[in-house]
């Protein structure tokens, strides 16, 4: 892939800021190295450059490749190859690039941290939520399901205006929005539940505008194994928000000796990690690790992006695969405390639950269990990934596809283990929880190398709409469902409680093993379609006026 | 109409039990909270007990002078509350209202919108 | 446990005479405070919820107010059918606790 002057602009042509506009006027009449107004070599101080050796670039999937000559500056020829050797001209440094990189990652891992633990902050206190404002179940429910709602919604609107906008400034107004609306939350008056009920559609929006965008920044600031471990990272924010979550939302109950306290600690912290996006995330372009050029602006529809990704096989069956994934996570997370709850009434060693919260310290468990399993999962993946990738290009959907069908071996050791065990139980949610979070940060990292950049936040955006409605939406609602269908049909027993919901939560395991037959299938088009989007990379940096994609 | 109807109070003696019952008419009872408050003759008014729908897991909740002694129960086929009470005290003798509390389907209110005409349960030796 | 404190005990006042009664909690409780009219002989009824949502059936003469720890009943214009004891109640935590009462009474 040709690299041109440095990683470039929107699709849909409203620019990045209007400064890049500027800046790319003066790069085109006189370059300069490191600490100039940024070659492929940097974007100013800290900026999240990529270096250029020579004339050797990094492709969309992280391979070198040699650049074709040509005269500096012109488009389509590796203009920074050959000024970043001018006269006077200073070589970028790489450490400090590094770091301003990665402190970026970080700050935008710290903001996903922040995402969920403001989510489980509300589970943690939930109970004391119901209880204060008279929720009846239904109306947890509805709190639930219109969060995800409203998630699923606004996650496609953000994926468009990430693929076309300012996308820190997006990222900053939707953490602000969010920190905003659950500080204002903690004072709703008891007889206004429907206004908690609106808060929580709002706080949806605001975490969609997270979630769909920042995946794509860390894209666009490191390639190949880097990117693996950074998304890794990000990822991993996922099972450590949710802990520290539940752990804010009862430790701040605790010692303020009201919940309403626990709802003001995330949108403090959201307003600071907004403000810290605001100041130390680059403003990068899209392709920016993948050296492209200033010519990416592809010009296309949002109808044109959706087709384009709905044709693209590997991200189709990637995303039903991570449909998959959220299926059984939201089940699980749902039900498997009280199923060990129901496991330990029926070996007599708990009582039968009369009075609500059922289970705890079963939750409390679990809850620990997977904000372990979760960094293991992250890590094994990555490594695991990493290793695999010496031996074949398709590792990264087929360690998903063994991490997931090795899941499901162990889930369905669970509803095994329960009936004698309840530590052999933890044991095989403990393995099972592992391996089906190894495939998180990998399931980015697919989209990232089929999904050009220009269709990313579109991309994880949908995925994200898809992976909630056939996922984590429905699955705790159709596990209990099919339970009560099963006891209706039962006697009344203790026995026939545990084994009713048993029966409902083994759906799980084939979902997962539906999951991993769709990674690999994903396996099978994997390099095809990422050769098929570098191709269209190198189209788009084409100078010719239009492009198709 | 809502109506609330106690009956099952009299006189008892100290430590001994009594259960008393509040059939209901006019409302969707199985979707609705019930409560039971009482007054001591001349006194103010106290809260007893709440026990919540099934959609709450028909939880109940108690107040510190009667927890362990008294157990609010729910039948919904019969759209009747119960309020068992063991191991009376003199100081449990009081008129016993049955109380509802005003239903929204997704969360209620914990106050009471409708009132029983009570029944008078005096515990002496 | 919250307190509710009603002030005055016992207020003596002419029948078309406007009055104001006191409540007061322990703790900061938002508007979930709620008051009740108890007639001699008679069961409680619920006349305002929420510090100031008037209920249907209740005449316009009583109106609410307040919110944090101090709220007031209003009764504009006192009829010989309000001489009552009135109580407030909180719903902020359980349990679920009533004030003392104040006792209108004609003067």
């Known amino acids: 892939m040709m690299c041109l002057e440095c990683a470039s602009a929107a699709a849909g042509g409203a620019e990045e800021e209007e400064a890049d506009a500027e800046r790319r006027r003066r790069r085109r009449g006189a370059q300069r190295g490191a600490g100039g107004s940024g070659c492929c070599g940097a974007r100013g101080a800290g900026g999240a450059g990529v270096s250029a050796a020579g004339d050797e670039v990094q492709t969309l999937s992280g391979s070198v490749r040699r650049a074709p000559t040509g005269p500096p500056g012109t488009p389509g020829t590796p203009g920074c190859a050959a000024t970043a050797k001018g006269p006077g001209a200073q070589q970028p440094k790489p450490a400090s690039l590094g770091r301003g990189r990665g402190a970026a990652a970080a700050i935008l891992s710290l903001g996903n941290v922040l995402n969920y633990l403001d989510r489980y902050t509300v589970a943690g206190v939930l109970l004391d939520i119901q209880q204060h404002f008279g929720v009846k179940d239904r109306g947890a429910g509805l709190l639930q399901s219109v969060f995800i709602c409203s998630f699923m919604v606004a996650a496609p609107i953000f994926g468009y205006l990430g693929d076309r906008f300012n996308r820190k400034v997006i990222l900053s107004c939707g953490i602000f929005f969010w920190s905003a609306v659950t500080f204002s939350s903690s004072f709703i008056p008891q007889q206004y539940f429907w206004l908690l009920v609106l808060s929580r559609g709002l706080v949806g929006i605001g975490e969609a505008s997270y979630s769909t965008i920042a995946p794509t920044i860390i894209g666009d600031l490191f390639t190949k194994n880097t990117r693996t471990l950074m998304l890794s990272v990000f990822y991993f924010a996922i099972p450590l928000g949710s802990g520290l979550g539940y752990i804010t939302g009862s430790s701040v109950k605790q010692a303020a000796g009201d919940w309403h306290w626990a709802l003001r600690v995330s949108p403090v912290l959201g307003m600071i990690t907004g403000t810290l996006i605001l100041i130390l995330v680059p403003a990068t372009k899209r392709g920016h690790a993948d050296q492209l050029g200033d010519q990416l602006k592809a010009r296309t529809s949002w109808l044109r992006d959706m087709k384009a990704l709905i044709r693209n096989r590997s991200y189709v069956f990637s995303s039903l695969a991570t449909s998959a994934v959220s299926f059984a996570t939201g089940a699980l997370g749902m039900w498997i405390p009280l199923y060990l709850h129901r496991a330990q009434v029926v070996q007599k060693t708990a009582e039968t639950c009369n009075s609500p919260p059922c289970g705890a310290k079963d939750s409390l468990i679990f809850g620990a269990i997977t904000c372990f399993t979760g960094f293991l999962g992250v890590v094994t993946g990555a490594g695991a990934t990493r290793w695999c990738r010496l031996k074949t290009q398709r590792a990264d959907p087929l360690v998903c596809a063994v991490g997931m069908l090795g899941s499901a071996i162990f889930i369905c050791l669970i509803f095994v283990a329960a009936k004698s065990s309840i530590v052999g139980a933890y044991i095989c949610i403990f393995v099972g929880e592992t391996l089906l979070f190894s495939n998180w940060a990998i399931t980015a990292d697919i989209l990232m190398y089929v999904v050009i950049p220009t269709r990313r936040a579109t991309a994880v955006a949908l995925q994200s709409f898809t992976s909630h409605l056939l996922g984590d939406a429905g699955s705790p609602y159709l596990i209990g469902f099919i339970s009560d269908l099963i006891r209706q049909s039962t006697k009344d027993s203790p026995l026939w409680e545990f084994l009713s919901l048993g029966y409902a939560l083994m759906l799980c395991p084939f979902v997962v093993v539906l999951g991993g037959m769709f990674f690999l299938a994903t396996a099978l088009f994997f390099v095809s379609d990422r050769a098929r989007a570098e191709q269209q990379v190198n189209q788009l940096a084409m100078p010719p006026a239009s492009v198709k994609v | 109409e809502v109506q609330l109807v106690e009956t099952g109070g009299g006189l008892v003696r100290p430590g001994s039990s009594l259960k008393l019952s509040c059939a209901t008419s006019?409302?969707?009872?199985?979707?609705?909270?019930m409560s039971w408050v009482r007054q001591a003759p001349g006194k103010g008014l106290e809260w007893v007990a709440l026990i919540k729908d099934k959609n709450s897991n028909s939880e109940a909740n108690y107040a510190e002078s009667i927890k362990g002694r008294f157990t609010i129960s729910r039948d919904d086929s019969k759209s009747r509350v119960y309020l068992q009470m063991n191991t009376l005290r003199d100081q449990d003798t009081a008129t016993y209202y049955c109380?509802?509390?005003?239903?929204?389907?997704?969360?209620?209110?914990?106050?009471?919108?409708?009132w029983g005409q009570g029944v008078m349960v005096t515990v002496s030796s | 446990d919250i307190v509710l404190t009603q002030s005055p005990p016992t207020l003596s006042v002419t029948p078309g005479e406007s009055v104001s009664l006191s409540c007061r909690a322990s703790?900061?409780?938002?508007?979930?405070i709620h008051w009740y009219q108890q007639r001699s002989n008679e069961s409680p009824r619920l006349l305002i919820k929420?510090?100031?949502q008037s209920i249907a059936g209740i005449p316009s003469r009583f109106s609410g107010s307040g919110s944090g720890t101090d709220f007031i009943l209003s009764i504009n214009r006192v009829e010989s059918e309000d001489f009552s004891v009135y109580y407030c109640q909180q719903t902020y935590s359980l349990p679920l606790t009533f004030g003392p009462g104040t006792k209108l009474e004609v003067k």
């Open positions: 703790q900061g409780i938002s508007t979930s």
């Open positions: 109380t509802r509390h005003e239903d929204f389907y997704y969360y209620s209110g914990y106050y009471f919108d409708y």
């Open positions: 006019g409302f969707t009872f199985s979707d609705t909270w």
């Open positions: 929420y510090a100031s």
